[in-house]
Interface confidence: low
């Protein structure tokens, strides 16, 4: 299963498989997630250790039992890989680190006006992995506003130093935000030259390409097929790079296939997993387990569920079968790829789906119509669960927001359907940032079922919650993925970093905004909220958020949208935008439906016929 909790002041002892420098625990966790053998990690922030060499140390660990002894270490942070965590698996890391210089090979320097512009330059440079920016207050005048683009052999900094007035971060290419664009073509019978950065065995060129995409230094690849003339090189996938970023030469060569990394694709990246099953093929590797199962698909599921399993072979040899079940060999290797690929066998092989982010994994932890006043523009993929609920009568218009909580489920406010209960008039747009991008050709989801809370009454503020079942399930991408739900009975007191998003009015008597807006709003206790709304009952099933002085709030058109809070590196849906007295008024916080109080209802309504919850439920 998916384990998302972090252990503070704890360090896992032993089990080391790799180490590197990372700016924080979340980035360390991401590197662990993508490392083929890492199950656990420990991170040492600068404050946790005097040894300069170990500051910002990220230690990736493996353990056959899934656990390692934890020792107390003040300031250290430890946790689990997010393998098996479905939509939480992402190589995208947007954070900017102030007062930190991430060292590497500086290959480009330019003057820019902001750290955001520096990050954009890095994202638009094919070789840039991370960057550092010297602010206008940097102590050496000649370096001020310098944007240094960097790379390193492992894709992570070679060192991280605390340095005032320097800001650092990573390329947003893994967020599918590069302006470079990508080459989707696969070139048959063509071999690329240049520097080999790694060599793995793969069953086909598509697996080779995906591995290249997620390798820190691979820009293009050449794959040697299983009929390549040199036996020892069959199924070899060579991951390559060059100074220029493109192959300096290519040679026509029978039974080779070449192509490019897809990391520079805009809006969509391949999933970091390989779902295809290869009949008549055996994958060799270190044996993890052997179990009798019925069918190759069950074998793949078994491999996926056993977190250390990387790939499998399902044997149909008579001696490996009894009754309807045959042996499922669960295997692993140092690099996550088979150590041997054999053809013409009576087996079928494939990979674990533990890094797929489209899975219906049900574990996260890994939680008056009112718009956003006082907010700022959001960026692509920042709030991938946000949807726009639009009504098409004679014209089409945005009415409410909503939150994607599963492949086929959206959570919103019940009052959005006041007077508009017909599901046919609604269109749901997901994975969008600008409403003006919507044309008649833009795909949308239609509603299969609207489930309004049974105790909701029109024009009352209570139980303002509704579920929408979509006619067809949505695929998850960097721009369209669900938000985790809170644990049942979560107290809002743990949440300190909360945001409201929507396309609603930017002032009380305003209009719908084109670009999705975001605003950081603190939660307010129910007691405080009740004082501000003496004519209404603020119940325990509501949560309030707002500034005492006003100025920032949700408003008309934001209803049904998310109030999300980040805790221990994970976003959770804490509230549904519901109502308020005007917008952003002084001492009039926004009132939100408290999602944690409705977990039983959400789980009950989203149960499919097979009894499995089809949304992102809490761990």
């Amino acid at each position: 299963g998916c384990l998302t909790q972090l252990y503070e002041n704890a360090f896992f002892r032993g089990g080391d498989v790799a180490s590197m420098y990372t700016p924080n625990a979340q980035y360390c966790q991401m590197r662990c997630t993508f490392h083929p053998r890492c199950l656990l990690f420990s991170f040492l922030p600068a404050s946790s250790i005097n040894d300069m060499e170990k500051r910002f140390g990220c230690f990736l660990k493996d353990s056959v039992t899934g656990t390692l002894p934890k020792v107390h270490r003040t300031g250290a942070v430890s946790g689990h890989s997010l393998k098996q965590c479905g939509h939480q698996i992402s190589a995208c890391h947007r954070d900017i680190y102030k007062g930190v210089d991430m060292r590497g090979v500086n290959f480009n320097v330019s003057k820019v006006s902001s750290v955001e512009e520096c990050q954009k330059r890095c994202t638009s440079n094919i070789r840039c992995q991370f960057f550092s920016y010297a602010t206008q207050t940097f102590h050496k005048a000649e370096y001020r506003n310098n944007c240094l683009l960097k790379y390193s052999p492992g894709g992570t900094p070679t060192a991280i130093k605390v340095l005032s007035n320097v800001e650092s971060g990573f390329s947003l290419k893994p967020c599918a935000l590069s302006e470079i664009g990508c080459h989707m073509n696969i070139f048959q019978h063509l071999a690329f030259s240049d520097v080999d950065v790694a060599r793995v065995l793969t069953p086909d060129a598509f697996v080779c390409r995906t591995i290249c995409t997620y390798h820190p230094n691979c820009l293009f690849f050449t794959f040697y097929t299983n009929v390549w003339k040199i036996e020892s090189q069959r199924n070899v996938c060579l991951l390559k790079t060059s100074e220029s970023g493109t192959p300096s030469s290519s040679t026509p060569q029978e039974n080779t296939i070449s192509g490019y990394s897809l990391l520079t694709c805009k809006r969509t990246l391949p999933e970091p997993c390989h779902s295809k099953i290869y009949p008549g093929v055996d994958f060799g590797g270190e044996e993890l387990n052997v179990t009798f199962v019925k069918g190759v698909n069950v074998c793949q599921e078994t491999c996926t569920k056993m977190i250390r399993c990387q790939f499998f072979t399902y044997s149909l040899l008579p001696e490996d079968c009894k009754e309807e079940k045959c042996k499922c060999f669960l295997r692993l290797s140092m690099d996550g790829s088979p150590t041997r690929i054999a053809y013409g066998t009576q087996g079928s092989s494939g990979y674990s789906l533990r890094l797929c982010n489209t899975g219906d994994n049900s574990v996260c932890t890994t939680k008056t119509s009112t718009r956003i006043v006082g907010g700022t523009n959001s960026s692509w993929g920042e709030w991938p669960w946000q949807v726009s609920l639009q009504v098409k009568l004679t014209a089409q218009r945005h009415l409410c927001g909503g939150s994607l909580i599963g492949h086929q489920w959206v959570l919103t406010a019940a009052h959005c359907f006041d007077g508009l209960p017909l599901q046919d008039v609604w269109r749901i747009y997901s994975g969008i940032l600008n409403l003006s991008d919507i044309t008649k050709d833009t795909p949308f989801s239609q509603i299969k079922e609207i489930i309004i809370h049974q105790n909701y009454k029109v024009s009352e503020g209570n139980h303002d919650i509704a579920l929408i079942k979509l006619q067809a399930p949505l695929n998850y991408t960097e721009f369209q993925k669900p938000i985790c739900l809170p644990s049942k009975g979560d107290t809002s007191t743990i949440y300190t970093n909360c945001w409201v998003t929507g396309w609603g009015f930017s002032k009380e008597k305003g209009e719908i905004q084109n670009i999705l807006q975001k605003v950081n709003i603190p939660l307010v206790t129910n007691e405080e909220c009740q004082k501000r709304y003496q004519d209404y009952k603020i119940t325990q099933r509501m949560v309030c958020a707002g500034y005492k002085e006003g100025g920032k709030d949700a408003c008309k058109g934001d209803s049904g949208g998310p109030l999300v809070c980040k805790h221990n590196g994970m976003w959770r849906l804490v509230g549904i935008t519901s109502w308020g007295e005007g917008c952003a008024r002084r001492e009039q916080p926004g009132v939100y439906t408290k999602v944690a109080e409705y977990m039983d209802w959400i789980l009950e309504k989203t149960q499919s016929s097979d009894g499995k919850a089809q949304m992102q439920s809490p761990a």
Partner: antibody, heavy 117, light 107 residues
């Protein structure tokens, strides 16, 4: 195939110490943790802790800290559990066990330790 | 520590009967649960684990279910060779803990 061979039964006096051994066969000894479990009629099965022979890392159940010490000898592929200051409450069958995936898939035959004056 | 409570402590049933043993954890163990069978004078034997289900070589009459804190081991049709004590064990957080055991006998 994987086998765990434990040392024979021990009859000990109160206050004495005992060393229980577990020889691992049929797999790479340094790749897998070795765990120890105590079984008594009253308390049933209790996890004592584990050692990773490759790294030497150990984990102990708080209840057995100061009572049990784990060591491992890579050359002889043998894990040891040293129990000190024995009392009648330490009378039990002790198992070494090795995980496969996560739970305990392989067990030794058990070593009966009897503490009696 | 997480407490594992098994019930019943013993059960007597006829050959062919369906036998159900329950195990309750004191907190959510995220499906990190294993079931073991122990026959007199022998070491425990792993039957079922939360990740992979039924272990290789374990008869299909054994099945496990449950989530969160409540788990069940079912023997769909009791056989004479199933006479043993059955234990559940959580491996969600150390110290790993076992249930107190359920003794299964033939009437």
């Amino acid at each position: 195939q994987v086998q765990l061979q434990q040392s024979g039964a021990e009859l000990m006096r109160p206050g004495a110490s005992v060393k229980v051994s577990c020889k691992a066969l049929g797999y790479t000894f340094t790749d897998y943790e070795m765990h120890w479990v105590k079984q008594t009629p009253v308390l049933g099965l209790e996890w004592i802790g584990a050692i990773h022979p490759g790294s030497g890392g150990t984990a102990y159940n708080q209840k057995f800290k100061g009572k049990a010490i784990f060591t491992a000898d890579k050359s002889s592929r043998t894990a040891y559990m040293y129990l000190s200051s024995l009392t009648s409450e330490d009378s039990a069958v002790y198992y070494c066990t090795r995980p496969y995936g996560y739970p305990f898939a392989y067990w030794g035959q058990g070593t009966l330790v009897t503490v009696s004056a | 520590d997480i407490q594992m409570t098994q019930s019943p402590s013993s059960v007597s049933a006829s050959v062919g009967d369906r036998v159900t043993i329950t195990c309750k954890a004191s907190e959510d163990i995220y499906n990190r649960l294993a079931w073991y069978q122990q026959k007199p004078g022998q070491a425990p034997r792993l039957l079922i684990s939360g990740e992979t289900g039924l272990e290789a070589g374990v008869p299909s009459r054994f099945s496990g279910s449950g989530s969160g804190t409540d788990f069940t081991l079912t023997i769909s049709s009791l056989q004479p060779e199933d006479v043993a004590t059955y234990y559940c064990q959580q491996y969600w957080s150390t110290p790993w803990t076992f249930g107190q055991g359920t003794k299964v006998e033939i009437k």
